[in-house]
Interface confidence: medium
């Protein structure tokens, strides 16, 4: 299953399959997730080790048993790959690292006014993988405001150095934010020239293209089909690059197929997995396990559930079958691709779905009336769980926010439905940033069921929570995916990085905003909050957030939206925007429904709604 917990001051001993430099544990975990054999990782921050060569070291590890002995090492951070973690699987990494220089091949330098502009340049450059930016206070005047675009053979820095007034980060191409655009065309009977960066075996050109998309240095590819004249080159997928970023030449060639990486696509990237099953094909590789199952789909499920399994062959040979079950061969290789592909067999083959980010039809959890005032514009995909609840009758209007917590579930505030409890007047827009982008052709979800907390009463602030079941499940993308819920009764975690988002008013007597706003707000203790609201009862089922001096808060139109906090690199839904005295007033914090206190209720309702378990626990 999915394991998300991080182990502080711990280092996994042995099992090394690769090592690299990464700026933090979260990026190290992402590299582990996408490495075909990595199950565990250990990361050494700069503060944890004196050896300069091992600072920022990210060590990717494998283990036949799925675990390794942990040794104590102060400052080290260890954890698990996020394979099998559904929507949490993403190659997108937005963080900017201050005081850090990520080294690589500097291939472009320009003057820019901000680190955000530098990151944008990197994202819009086909070869850029990461960048460094020298701020205006950098010690050497001639380097100030320099934006260095970089790449490396492995896509990660060749070294990372602590350096004042330098900020570094990664290209946002894996976030589907590139302005370059992509070539979706597949070119039959055409071979591309240039530099081969890797060679793998694939059953078709589409798998080849997906592998190219997620390979750090692949810009285009050529695939040799299973009828290619040279037998030893059949099913070979050549991943390629060039100085210019495009093929310098192409040659008409029978039984070859060429195409481009889709990493530069805007708004949508292919999933990093291959779901197709190939009948009459055997995939060769190292044997992991053999099991008897009924049908090729069950064989694929078995492979997906066994975390080390990369691909499988389901044999229909009479000697491999007994009654209705046949042998399911679970296999792996060094690079995640078959070592041999044979056609015209009695088998069916395919890949593990462990890296598919659609996950199952569930809500995400972890084991362990009110625009934002004083906020700033959000960017695409920054808050992919945020939805807009709109009412359409004589006019269509944004009324509330909400949070996507599963393919078919949205969590919001009960008071959003005061006087409007009818599902057919509501439209739910997800995966949007700008309300003015909504046109008559913009897809929306309709409500199947509104579940208001049984103890909620109109005009009272208690139990202000409601679940929405959508009529049809949503697919997950970089711009539309769920937020994880906290553990039941989560009281021990101290959240220091919390944000409220919404399209609500920017001042008490304002209007709905077009661009989704965000504001960083500190949590306030319930005792402190109670002092500020002496006429109301602040219960343990509420959480408060705000600045003593005011100025930043949720406001009308943000109701039902998320208060999210980042902890151990993971966002969790801590609160639901509920109520407050005015907006952003001095010593009047915003009051939010505390989600952790309603976990039993959420579980009960999402499970009982259609009789099957809807909850998924990645930890």
């Amino acid at each position: 299953g999915c394991l998300t917990q991080l182990y502080e001051n711990a280092f996994f001993r042995g099992g090394d399959v690769a090592s690299m430099y990464t700026p933090n544990a979260q990026y190290c975990q992402m590299r582990c997730t996408f490495h075909p054999r990595c199950l565990l990782f250990s990361f050494l921050p700069a503060s944890s080790i004196n050896d300069m060569e091992k600072r920022f070291g990210c060590f990717l590890k494998d283990s036949v048993t799925g675990t390794l002995p942990k040794v104590h090492r102060t400052g080290a951070v260890s954890g698990h790959s996020l394979k099998q973690c559904g929507h949490q699987i993403s190659a997108c990494h937005r963080d900017i690292y201050k005081g850090v220089d990520m080294r690589g091949v500097n291939f472009n330098v320009s003057k820019v006014s901000s680190v955000e502009e530098c990151q944008k340049r990197c994202t819009s450059n086909i070869r850029c993988q990461f960048f460094s930016y020298a701020t205006q206070t950098f010690h050497k005047a001639e380097y100030r405001n320099n934006c260095l675009l970089k790449y490396s053979p492995g896509g990660t820095p060749t070294a990372i150095k602590v350096l004042s007034n330098v900020e570094s980060g990664f290209s946002l191409k894996p976030c589907a934010l590139s302005e370059i655009g992509c070539h979706m065309n597949i070119f039959q009977h055409l071979a591309f020239s240039d530099v081969d960066v890797a060679r793998v075996l694939t059953p078709d050109a589409f798998v080849c293209r997906t592998i190219c998309t997620y390979h750090p240095n692949c810009l285009f590819f050529t695939f040799y089909t299973n009828v290619w004249k040279i037998e030893s080159q059949r099913n070979v997928c050549l991943l390629k690059t060039s100085e210019s970023g495009t093929p310098s030449s192409s040659t008409p060639q029978e039984n070859t197929i060429s195409g481009y990486s889709l990493l530069t696509c805007k708004r949508t990237l292919p999933e990093p997995c291959h779901s197709k099953i190939y009948p009459g094909v055997d995939f060769g590789g190292e044997e992991l396990n053999v099991t008897f199952v009924k049908g090729v789909n069950v064989c694929q499920e078995t492979c997906t559930k066994m975390i080390r399994c990369q691909f499988f062959t389901y044999s229909l040979l009479p000697e491999d079958c007994k009654e209705e079950k046949c042998k399911c061969f679970l296999r792996l290789s060094m690079d995640g691709s078959p070592t041999r592909i044979a056609y015209g067999t009695q088998g069916s083959s395919g890949y593990s779905l462990r890296l598919c980010n659609t996950g199952d039809n569930s809500v995400c959890t972890t084991k362990t009336s009110t625009r934002i005032v004083g906020g700033t514009n959000s960017s695409w995909g920054e808050w992919p769980w945020q939805v807009s609840l709109q009412v359409k009758l004589t006019a269509q209007r944004h009324l509330c926010g909400g949070s996507l917590i599963g393919h078919q579930w949205v969590l919001t505030a009960a008071h959003c439905f005061d006087g409007l409890p009818l599902q057919d007047v509501w439209r739910i827009y997800s995966g949007i940033l700008n309300l003015s982008d909504i046109t008559k052709d913009t897809p929306f979800s309709q409500i199947k069921e509104i579940i208001i907390h049984q103890n909620y009463k109109v005009s009272e602030g208690n139990h202000d929570i409601a679940l929405i079941k959508l009529q049809a499940p949503l697919n997950y993308t970089e711009f539309q995916k769920p937020i994880c819920l906290p553990s039941k009764g989560d009281t021990s975690t101290i959240y220091t990085n919390c944000w409220v988002t919404g399209w609500g008013f920017s001042k008490e007597k304002g209007e709905i905003q077009n661009i989704l706003q965000k504001v960083n707000i500190p949590l306030v203790t319930n005792e402190e909050c109670q002092k500020r609201y002496q006429d109301y009862k602040i219960t343990q089922r509420m959480v408060c957030a705000g600045y003593k001096e005011g100025g930043k808060d949720a406001c009308k139109g943000d109701s039902g939206g998320p208060l999210v906090c980042k902890h151990n690199g993971m966002w969790r839904l801590v609160g639901i925007t509920s109520w407050g005295e005015g907006c952003a007033r001095r010593e009047q914090p915003g009051v939010y429904t505390k989600v952790a206190e309603y976990m039993d209720w959420i579980l009960e309702k999402t499970q009982s709604s259609d009789g099957k378990a809807q909850m998924q626990s990645p930890a």
Epitope: K392, T394, A395, R397, L420, L422, D424, I438, T439, K440
Partner: antibody, heavy 118, light 107 residues
Framework: EVQLLESGGGLVQPGGSLRLSCAAS????????MHWVRQAPGKGLEWVSG????????QYADSVKGRFTISRDNSKNTLYLQMNSLRAEDTAVYYC???????????WGQGTMVTVSS | DIQMTQSPSSLSASVGDRVTITCRAS??????LNWYQQKPGKAPKVLIH???TLESGVPSRFSGSGSGTDFTLTISSLQPEDFATYYC?????????FGQGTKVEIK
């Protein structure tokens, strides 16, 4: 072809009642909001009433509140407007209209004339 | 209720002329504004929704602009079939309200 066809208009005395119908065809009636809009002779357009797809939620212009009732029968693909306590100022062509993906009324019927006069 | 004021209430123009009709809302309505064309004895027909989005099938000589309280409908080159009455309508809040209309006549 997407069509709306009104019927039920006519001459009625002040204080009298009339029931307008609007037959819909060519689209899935049950998923659309529906509205009545009227136009007095030589005057502009005035929204009268709207109803949600299931019929559970209705809204009215202040000028007709308490006198007019909008309803629908999704099994018959028909929208209704029950008009009671009619006044001379209710004299108008009554259109049923369907809003499109957002708010504009993109489909209109041909209209039915209601005359309130003694 | 939001009041919608159109100007002029009528205008005379020739075929080929550029015609501009303005519509002002009594409060900000963002871009929730639609334009309709109505010919005598006929039902209105939507031309533009969301202030500037041309309805499919409507000739490109029609265009809309504006945001907040001030909006414009422009006919770049008036054609014989364009002589009609034009209405703006806000869909920002209930009740939806229409302008009083602008009649475009042949000079």
């Amino acid at each position: 072809e997407v069509q709306l066809l009104e019927s039920g208009g006519g001459l009625v005395q002040p204080g009298g009642s009339l029931r307008l119908s609007c037959a819909a065809s060519g689209f899935t009636f049950s998923v659309y909001l529906m509205h009545w809009v009227r136009q007095a002779p030589g005057k502009g357009l005035e929204w009268v009433s709207g109803i949600s797809p299931s019929g559970g939620y209705t809204q009215y212009a202040d000028s007709v509140k308490g006198r007019f009732t909008i309803s629908r029968d999704n099994s018959k693909n028909t929208l209704y407007l029950q008009m009671n306590s009619l006044r001379a100022e209710d004299t108008a062509v009554y259109y049923c209209a369907r809003p499109g993906g957002l708010d504009a009324f993109d489909i209109w019927g041909q209209g039915t004339m209601v005359t309130v006069s003694s | 209720d939001i009041q919608m004021t159109q100007s002029p209430s009528s205008l005379s123009a020739s075929v080929g002329d550029r015609v501009t009709i303005t519509c002002r809302a009594s409060q900000s309505i963002n871009t929730y504004l639609n334009w309709y064309q109505q010919k005598p004895g006929k039902a209105p027909k939507v031309l533009i929704h969301a202030a500037s989005t041309l309805e499919s099938g409507v000739p490109s000589r029609f265009s809309g602009s504006g945001s907040g309280t001030d909006f414009t409908l422009t006919i770049s080159s008036l054609q014989p079939e364009d002589f009609a009455t034009y209405y703006c309508q806000q869909s920002y809040s209930t009740p939806p309200t229409f302008g009083q209309g602008t009649k475009v006549e042949i000079k």
